[in-house]
């Protein structure tokens, strides 16, 4: 018997955001904020542990 | 069709306070942030702030000129969204508008005008 | 605040010439992540509310005509109306959504000569 697709997102898609398209999601604070308020993270030096970097993701339109 | 309708808008004296309401139909009300911006007479226009949707539970954003003087406010079951403004100046005189949020400021109302003097 | 300036404050053309107007800002908009420059420009035609016609800088709002064209990043944007008409007579605002609080420049007024 088929299946249908257990998702209609890859498994490495980014998971959809409650952001309306002019903001972006903050995942250290958890909601929306304007873009320019995230920094994207520098790289660390190899070997540095640190908690997972702010980042944003972008709703696609 | 998008359609925004303000009202509230008149005369008040220096100190005063006022109510404008932006009246939603169209779109589903909970589903999309609604901002307000004004216009002094023959001016440019000053975003004041908006209010997120349902999903991010109605948090709001302000201008800091603002703050702490106007406080933006919805009635979801009444479509309806506001815009609640103390101790008003001088200043504060101008056509008041309400926009839906979505790529930027997506849909404006006609606006109401509000007048502060004495 | 991000402070958004515009030029010309005015500009008198006739109806079929190309004409560009200038918007800057005193910090960059563009969103490295996503590539997306957070500026919108508006028109505001006499007596009536503005109008959304381009976003994240270069895209076009549905239903607005192929003769506005929006280009530019980072801290330089520019309004370009490729055929002017009559009915463009209108003030033409930018504005940034990149952080708060969203900031207008002082606007561009289209005259038809």
């Known amino acids: 018997m088929r299946r249908g697709p257990r998702s209609l997102r890859g498994r490495d898609a980014p998971a959809p955001t409650p952001c309306v398209p002019a903001e972006c999601f903050d995942l250290l604070v958890a909601h929306c904020v304007a873009c320019g308020l995230l920094r994207t993270p520098r790289p660390k030096p190899a070997g540095a542990s640190s908690p997972a970097p702010r980042t944003a993701l972008q709703p696609q339109e | 069709e998008v359609k925004l309708v303000e009202s509230g808008g008149g005369l008040v004296q220096p100190g005063g306070s006022l109510r404008l309401s932006c009246a939603i139909s169209?779109?589903?009300?909970?589903?999309?942030?609604m901002s307000w911006v004004r216009q002094p007479p023959g001016k440019a226009l000053e975003w004041l702030g908006f209010?997120?949707?349902?999903?991010?539970?109605?948090?709001?954003e302000y201008n800091p000129s603002v703050k702490g003087r106007f406080t933006i406010s919805r009635d979801n079951s009444q479509s309806i969204f506001y815009l609640q403004m103390n101790t008003l100046r001088a200043e504060d005189s101008a056509t008041y508008y309400c926009?839906?949020?979505?790529?930027?400021?997506?849909?404006w109302g006609q606006g109401t005008t509000v007048t502060v003097s004495a | 605040d991000i402070v958004m300036s515009q030029s010309p404050s005015s500009l008198a053309v006739s109806v079929g010439e190309k004409v560009t107007m200038s918007c800057k800002s005193s910090?960059?908009?563009?969103?490295?992540?996503?590539?997306?420059?957070?500026l919108a420009w508006y028109q505001q035609k006499p007596g009536q509310s503005p109008k959304l016609l381009i976003y994240?800088?270069?895209t076009r709002e549905s239903g607005v005509p192929d003769r506005f064209t929006g280009s530019g990043s980072g801290t330089d944007f520019t309004l370009t109306i490729s055929s002017v008409k009559a009915e463009d007579l209108a003030v033409y605002y930018c504005?940034?959504?990149?952080?708060?609080?969203?900031?207008f420049g002082g606007g561009t007024k289209l005259e038809i000569k």
């Open positions: 504005q940034q959504y990149y952080t708060y609080p969203y900031t």
């Open positions: 169209g779109f589903t009300v909970t589903a999309y942030y």
């Open positions: 910090q960059s908009l563009l969103y490295s992540s996503n590539q997306n420059n957070y």
């Open positions: 926009a839906q949020v979505r790529r930027a400021l997506d849909y």
């Open positions: 994240w800088a270069s």
């Open positions: 209010i997120r949707d349902k999903a991010n539970g109605y948090t709001t």
